[in-house]
Interface confidence: low
């Protein structure tokens, strides 16, 4: 009888854990949807305002090939850096190639000197894999130097010509990126 009761109790506990997990997933999903909604709104506003002036990038953004970059004049923690890029219809910088890395680091040298800038790279808490915001993995030459011994969430940032890692709750400048508008000729 006692064994039966404890089995039922364990089953109930397992059910509770599953429900908590589902609730947590739903909360994450809801937050993600809210951010995506804001991104879409910002993107629409951005597209409309850009349609009026035909330059490929907004004021204060730098152009390189098909991308526009915004180097922040304020600093914030990684999560809020991403939110602020979303608000501008962009995302945190995703470095696709060494050429792009060279352009970014060269531009930063001219603009600001040797500061820390968040990019859209974070470490998956479970697997320890580095991931860009779109879920893709960085190319081997663009993995952050192992610098952070933090037990907290770890995110990637650019400093001078290096890609480094740090606790996501530290405050840094950040770089946003979005597609440049094609001029309609």
């Amino acid at each position: 009888k006692l064994l039966q009761v404890s089995t039922i109790a364990m089953q109930q506990q397992e059910k509770l854990i599953q429900q908590e997990r589902a609730l947590l997933n739903f909360t994450e999903w809801k937050r993600s949807c809210a951010l995506q909604m804001k991104y879409c709104q910002a993107f629409m506003q951005n597209s409309l305002s850009s349609a009026h002036n035909s330059s490929p990038c907004p004021n204060n953004w730098i152009q390189n090939r098909e991308s526009c970059y915004y180097v922040s004049e304020i600093w914030s923690i990684w999560h809020t850096s991403q939110e602020n890029c979303l608000k501008e219809g962009s995302t945190l910088l995703q470095i696709e190639s060494k050429e792009e890395m060279d352009f970014i680091t060269g531009s930063l040298r001219k603009i600001k000197g040797s500061y820390d800038y968040w990019v859209g790279l974070s470490q998956d808490g479970h697997s320890g894999r580095w991931l860009w915001q779109d879920g893709s993995s960085p190319s081997p030459g663009l993995l952050p130097a192992e610098r952070s011994q933090s037990a907290n969430q770890v995110c990637g940032y650019v400093k001078s010509n290096s890609l480094l890692s740090s606790n996501c709750s530290t405050w840094k400048y950040f770089i946003c990126e979005k597609y440049a508008l094609r001029s309609s000729v």
Epitope: E73, T80, E83, N84
Partner: nanobody
Framework: DVQLVESGGGLVQAGGSLRLSCATS????????TGWYRQAPGREREFVAQ????????YYADSVKGRFTISRDNARNTVYLQMNNLKPGDTAIYYC??????????WGQGTQVTVSS
């Protein structure tokens, strides 16, 4: 003219509580994200807590997690920091700030918090 005015600091015994307020004026409060920093004598100013503009997500320094709570009231243009279970190590001047993309960041004058053991 943008102004951030902190209040609520004071002297409290270890284990006690304080609630800091930061009243802002001259900015569109709801589009700024706001945070608290602190600076102890002879140390760098350090991040304490922040609340985002978009969905009231909150972020905390590890040293205050579980003890401090940041909140904001957009109707009153005010951000709060509820500090519980205070420790002597929390003694510092606490500053409130407001910032947004492409704009400057604004700071208050600070309010002194002293925790005695």
């Amino acid at each position: 003219d943008v102004q951030l005015v902190e209040s609520g600091g004071g002297l409290v015994q270890a284990g006690g509580s304080l609630r800091l307020s930061c009243a802002t004026s001259g900015l569109t409060f709801s589009s700024y994200y706001t945070g608290w920093y602190r600076q102890a004598p002879g140390r760098e100013r350090e991040f304490v807590a922040q609340i985002s503009w978009s969905d009231d997500s909150t972020y905390y320094a590890d040293s205050v997690k579980g003890r401090f709570t940041i909140s904001r009231d957009n109707a009153r243009n005010t951000v709060y920091l509820q500090m519980n279970n205070l420790k002597p190590g929390d003694t510092a001047i606490y500053y409130c700030d407001a910032r947004k993309v492409g704009g400057p960041d604004y700071w208050g004058q600070g309010t002194q918090v002293t925790v005695s053991s």
